[in-house]
C-alpha cells in the first residue's frame, strides 16, 4: 500500500521568497505512479494544482498561473517536491500531496493523501527563538492514590507558527497512546498548547514520552520530552509542605548534557 | 463547472446515535462521476473513508455506509455508531477515473461538513479535581463529569496569567477538562470547580502523606527548570540524543 509523508508540517516564508514542500512516497515505486498536489486555502474548497506522472509528464490545473508552481520527483529519495515561487499572501494554504493506490481487487483504486504542509507567510523573519518550550507536569499523588491512575501533562509554549503535532508513546514502544489536548491558544504573537495522557497505575512505573513535531524544532527533528517513571509504592507527598524535604528523600533525576 | 455542496456546514452528533451526511452535485448528473468521502481530523490528516464500488478505507467498513441517491443527485454517508474519534471535517469529492473516455484522475472537492461529537444524554456525574504544579505553572485537572457546563477557578492572590480551559470528551463518554495558569504563589494555589450547582475543591481529594515530589532535577542548559529545587522539572528534552538520562535513588 502506498503511504505519503510530508515531513514539514508547516513552512514559514517571508514575502517573495521560494517555498519548497516535500512529499515522501513509500510502499510504492515513485517512478511507477503519478503524484498529485492539492491546495486548501482558508475557507475555500480543496483544489487540484499540479501533478507529475510516472513518465515525468507535468499537468497543471487550468487557471493556475504558469511559472508559479513547479513539481518534480527524485526517484533516489522517493520524493516529490512542489516549489512555489515568489510567495505572496494568496499562497497561504495547506498543500497536500496525493496518489492513486490500487486496492486488492482489480480495478479498485483510492486516492490517498499526505498529512499536508501549511504555508505561512510573514512580512519579516521572526526575531525570537520560537521553538516549542516544554514544561512537564507529573501526576498528583491524590490522583494516583484515589484513582489508581495518573495523568501526565505536557505544556508547550512560545512557539510559532501555530502548527504543531503532539503524540505520546511509552519508552521502547512505537505504539501511539490515546491522549487528549487543548486547543492551540495565542499568547501575544506566539502560541501555546498542552496535551495530557492518563495511564493506569500499572503503567506509572514506565517512562513516557511526549513527542512534538514543529517546524522550528532544533535540528528539524521531533522533540522528545521524557516523563520519568513514578514509583507509586515508594513515593509519598504532603501537599501542604511542598518544600520541606531534603533532596535525598526524593528520586534524583540527573541529566548529562552531551550536546556540542 | 460542477460543484459539490454539503447539506450542512456543521452537524452535531451524539455518541452511538447514527448520523447522515449529504452532499449534492450541481451542474452535472452524479451518475457520471465516482463519489469519494474523506475525513480531515485535527492536525490536517486527510483519511479516505469511502469510494463508490463499495471501497472503504481501513477501519471504516463497519461503522460507515456510503450511498448515492441518483434521483436526488446526491451522495450520502452514514455514520452508524459515532464515537469521539469520528469528530472532524467530512469532504465529498468526485472523479471519473476508470470510466473511460475523457476521464479525470483529479478529485473535485466540496466544502467540508464539520462533525462535532457530544456524549449521549446520561445521569449527572460529579467531577474529581486534582492540581498539578511546576514552578509558577499550575494545572487543574477535572475528570469524568457530566453535563458539560462547568466553571473552573484557580484560587490565587498572585495571578500572572490564566488560559481558557480545555474541555474534551473522555474515553468513557463523559467530559474531562484542564485549566492552566501561572502564579507567583503557585504552592498555595488550589482549584475549585462549580458543576451542577455544587462546588468541588481540589483539597477534597488531597491525601496526607510525607515527602515532596516525584523527581528533583539537576539543572542543565537545555532543560527547562523551575526557580525552586522543590518543584518538578520544567522538562527533560531529547532532541536527537542531546541528553543521557540516569535515575538514582
Amino acid at each position: 500500500a502506498g503511504h505519503l509523508e510530508q515531513p514539514q508540517i508547516s513552512s514559514t516564508k517571508t514575502l517573495s521568497k521560494t517555498a519548497r514542500l516535500e512529499c515522501v512516497v513509500s510502499g510504492i515505486t515513485i517512478s511507477a505512479t503519478s503524484v498529485y498536489w492539492y491546495r486548501e486555502r482558508p475557507g475555500e474548497v480543496i483544489q487540484f494544482l499540479v501533478s507529475i506522472s510516472y513518465d515525468g509528464t507535468v499537468r497543471k490545473e487550468s487557471g493556475i498561473p504558469s511559472g508559479k508552481f513547479e513539481v518534480d520527483r527524485i526517484p533516489e529519495t522517493s520524493t516529490s517536491t512542489l516549489t512555489i515561487h515568489n510567495v505572496e499572501k494568496q499562497d497561504i494554504a495547506t498543500y497536500y500531496c496525493a496518489l492513486w493506490e490500487a486496492q486488492q481487487e482489480l480495478g479498485k483504486k483510492i486516492k490517498v493523501f499526505g498529512p499536508g504542509t501549511k504555508l505561512i507567510i510573514t512580512d519579516k523573519q521572526l526575531d525570537a527563538d520560537v521553538s516549542p518550550k516544554p514544561t512537564i507536569f507529573l501526576p498528583s499523588i491524590a490522583e494516583t492514590k484515589l484513582q489508581k491512575a495518573g495523568t501526565y501533562l505536557c505544556l508547550l509554549e512560545k512557539f510559532f507558527p501555530d502548527v504543531i503535532k503532539i503524540h505520546w508513546q511509552e519508552k521502547k514502544s512505537n505504539t501511539i497512546l490515546g491522549s487528549q489536548e487543548g486547543n492551540t491558544m495565542k499568547t501575544n504573537d506566539t502560541y501555546m498548547k498542552f496535551s495530557w495522557l492518563t495511564v493506569p497505575e500499572k503503567s506509572l512505573d514506565k517512562e513516557h514520552r511526549c513527542i512534538v513535531r514543529h517546524e522550528n524544532n532544533k535540528n528539524g527533528v521531533d522533540q522528545e520530552i521524557i516523563f520519568p517513571p513514578i514509583k507509586t509504592d515508594v513515593i509519598t507527598m504532603d501537599p501542604k509542605d511542598n518544600c520541606s524535604k531534603d533532596a535525598n528523600d526524593t528520586l534524583l533525576l540527573q541529566l548529562t548534557n552531551t550536546s556540542a | 463547472a460542477i460543484e459539490l455542496v454539503p447539506e450542512h456546514q456543521t452537524v452535531p452528533v451524539s455518541i452511538g446515535v447514527p448520523a447522515t451526511l449529504r452532499c449534492s452535485m450541481k451542474g452535472e448528473a452524479i451518475g457520471n462521476y465516482y463519489i469519494n468521502w474523506y475525513r480531515k481530523t485535527q492536525g490536517n490528516t486527510m483519511t479516505f473513508i469511502y469510494r463508490e464500488k463499495d471501497i472503504y478505507g481501513p477501519g471504516f467498513k463497519d461503522n460507515f455506509q456510503g450511498d448515492i441517491d441518483i434521483a436526488k443527485n446526491l451522495a450520502v454517508l452514514k455514520i452508524l455508531a459515532p464515537s469521539e474519534r469520528d469528530e472532524g471535517s467530512y469532504y465529498c469529492a468526485c472523479d471519473t477515473l476508470g470510466m473511460g473516455g475523457e476521464y479525470t484522475d483529479k478529485l473535485i472537492f466540496g466544502k467540508g461538513t464539520r462533525v462535532t461529537v457530544e456524549p449521549r444524554s446520561q445521569p449527572h456525574t460529579k467531577p474529581s479535581v486534582f492540581v498539578m504544579k511546576n514552578g509558577t505553572n499550575v494545572a487543574c485537572l477535572v475528570k469524568e463529569f457530566y453535563p458539560k457546563d462547568i466553571r473552573i477557578n484557580l484560587v490565587s492572590s498572585k495571578k500572572i496569567t490564566e488560559f481558557d480551559p480545555a474541555i474534551v470528551i473522555s474515553p468513557s463518554g463523559k467530559y474531562n477538562a484542564v485549566k492552566l495558569g501561572k502564579y507567583e504563589d503557585s504552592n498555595s494555589v488550589t482549584c475549585s470547580v462549580q458543576h451542577d450547582n455544587k462546588t468541588v475543591h481540589s483539597t477534597d481529594f488531597e491525601v496526607k502523606t510525607d515527602s515532596t515530589d516525584h523527581v528533583k532535577p539537576k539543572e542543565t542548559e537545555n532543560t527547562k527548570q523551575p526557580s525552586k529545587s522543590c518543584h518538578k522539572p520544567k522538562a527533560i528534552v531529547h532532541t536527537e540524543k542531546v541528553n543521557m538520562m540516569s535515575l538514582t535513588v
Epitope: 519579516k124 521572526l126 526575531d127 527563538d129 501575544n188 504573537d189 | 542548559e221
Partner: antibody, heavy 123, light 106 residues
Amino acid sequence: QVQLQESGPALVKPTQTLTLTCTFSGFSLSSSGMCVSWIRQPPGKALEWLTLIDWFDDKYYSTSLKTRLTISKDTSKNQVVLTMTNMDPVDTATYYCARIRGTGAYYYGLDVWGQGTMVTVSS
Amino acid sequence: SYELMQPPSVSVSPGQTASITCSGNELGDKYASWYQQQPGQSPVLVIYQDNKRPSGIPERFSGSNSGNTATLTISGTQAMDEADYYCQAWDSSKVVFGGGTKLTVL
C-alpha cells in the same frame, strides 16, 4: 520610569569569576515579552552582545562565550545576575544591562540601558 | 553565525543628510534597529523595527531596510549628532550588533 543599574567589582584578577548584578525598576520581568540583556564594550571598541534572559526564564548566550556565561533572574528582587568565569585581561570592558520589550516573536530593540560598569581584569 | 557590516566612518556637513549603511545576508527579511552612542555615554535606541522611532527621538532620524542593506538616515544633521552608531538585528533570540560607524559632523 524605567531604570537599570549595574553593580559589581571594578577589578577582578585573571582566572577569577566575575559576578555582576542588574537591578531594575519601572517594569516586571514576569510580564510577557520582557527581557533583560547584557552587553559589553571594551575601551574604544564596538558593542558585543553577551546574553539575555526573558520573562519565560529562557536564556540565550553568545556562541563564542556560552561556556563561560550564566544568566539568572530574581523576579521578586527585580534583579538579573551575570556570572562570567575564567576572566582574562581581554575581558576588560564596560558591562551594560539593557531592557528589551517584545511580543514573543518580535522585539522592539534594547530600549533602555543602564549607565554601565567598568570592569578591569588585571593581576 | 550572522554578521552585520558597517563602514567605520562617515562624514557630513551640518545641515546635510547623513546615511549610514548596515549590510547582512538578506537583512531586509529581518527587523533592524539603530543605536546612537555619544562619547562616554550609554547607547540610546534611535530606530527599531526598521523605521520606527522611540518617543523623544527627533524626526530627522529615519530608517529603511530592504535587500541586504539597512540604512539610518539623519536629515539636517546637527553637531550634536556626532557619535558612534550601531545597527542591530536578531538571530533566533540572539542579538547581533554591527561593528559601529563613527559619524563626524564637519
